[in-house]
């Protein structure tokens, strides 16, 4: 049985203030049951990105379809990214529990903000 | 196509204990969580048990005398019912769980059921 | 635990007609809502999942709507096969996953 893998393959992401961050996540199984979330940062000061559940996170979208089955694919776009985005962003697997409870985590994306280009 | 089979049912004392089967074909089983559902006489739908890899996940009213299992080197997913009361009187339906992207699970494929009676 | 209530227990449509029932939820689902049909004798079958997308194979004439608390399936032009028993399923928040009571479509 193949072990859950998560897999960031950008290091690092650069962006210019306004535009937007894709930051790309890719898992290699549907195993253990349980939810994708997205943090900046690591530790008790981590900020939760998106997950299905809590919201509304009206500049983040999916880059999958949600309603798609066995998706495997939980990328996120981030709109109109200013200097706050900045920050290391980590794809994180939880297992479903009462509470969920972290699984696994990517190896993160740092994502730099440019200057606007005048 | 896909193809679940249940077997293992019958007339059991109160008490007694029951182990049935769901035998899986047409898809890659190892890969997809797996659910029991059962309906009393009569009456509708109720969740018992959800099996993933080894995580499992119990309704209240059964947990402590069902456990579910698979083995996925053959294809087949287990219910072990012990310490069987009068209400646990059913049909109990093998199902395939779909999994949504950022959501949870719903039941795409389901077997035709084994009845169980749970009478002295 | 999420409940949910479907409406009516049981609704008397002629052959042809359109049928409309309802799943109303306990608590916020979003849409992750399915619907399943179960004939007489048989297992349930999925009609809908993600409150409005048809799985493979569903006629057309099944239909999901709603989101958050208020869901309904609605089938247009009642065929003969279509007499049966209709539950809905959220999962949202499970463990537990939880079902309707579910509504009887019945030839009137």
């Known amino acids: 049985e193949e072990e859950l893998q998560i897999i960031q393959p950008d290091k690092s992401v650069s962006v210019a203030a306004g535009e937007s961050a894709i930051l790309h996540c890719t898992i290699t199984s549907l195993f253990p049951v349980g939810p994708i979330q997205w943090f900046r940062g690591a530790g008790p000061a981590r900020v939760l990105i998106y997950n299905q559940r809590q919201g509304p996170f009206p500049r983040v979208t999916t880059v999958s379809e949600t309603t798609k089955r066995e998706n495997m694919d939980f990328s996120i776009s981030i709109s109109n990214i200013t200097p706050a985005d900045a920050g290391t962003y980590y794809c994180i697997k939880f297992r479903k529990g009462s509470p969920d409870t972290e699984f696994k985590s990517g190896a993160g994306t740092e994502l730099s903000v440019r200057a606007k280009p005048s | 196509d896909v193809q679940l089979v249940e077997s293992g049912g019958g007339v059991v004392q109160p008490g007694g204990s029951l182990r049935l089967s769901c035998a899986a074909s047409?898809?890659?089983?190892?890969?997809?969580?797996m659910t029991w559902v059962r309906q009393a006489p009569g009456e509708g739908l109720e969740w018992v048990s959800t099996i993933g890899s080894g995580d499992t996940y119990y309704a209240d009213s059964v947990k402590g005398r069902f456990t579910i299992s698979r083995d996925n080197s053959k294809n087949t997913l287990y219910l072990q019912m012990n310490s069987l009361r009068a209400e646990d009187t059913a049909v109990y339906y093998c199902?395939?769980?779909?999994?949504?992207?950022?959501?949870?699970?719903?039941?795409?494929?389901w077997g035709l059921g084994t009845r169980v009676t749970v009478s002295s | 635990e999420i409940v949910l209530t479907q409406s009516p227990a049981t609704l008397s449509v002629s052959p042809g007609e359109r049928a409309t029932f309802s799943c109303r939820a306990s608590q916020n689902v979003k849409n992750d809502l399915a619907w399943y049909q179960q004939r007489p004798g048989q297992a349930p079958r999925l009609l809908i999942y993600a409150a409005r997308i048809r799985e493979t194979g569903i006629p057309e004439r099944f239909s999901g709507s709603g989101s958050g608390t208020e869901f309904t399936l609605t089938i247009t032009s009642l065929q003969s096969e279509d007499f049966a028993v209709y539950y809905c399923q959220q999962y949202y928040d499970w463990p537990p996953f939880t079902f309707g009571g579910g509504t009887k479509v019945e030839i009137k």
């Open positions: 047409g898809f890659s089983f190892s890969n997809f969580a």
């Open positions: 199902a395939k769980d779909s999994t949504v992207s950022w959501s949870g699970d719903f039941f795409d494929y």
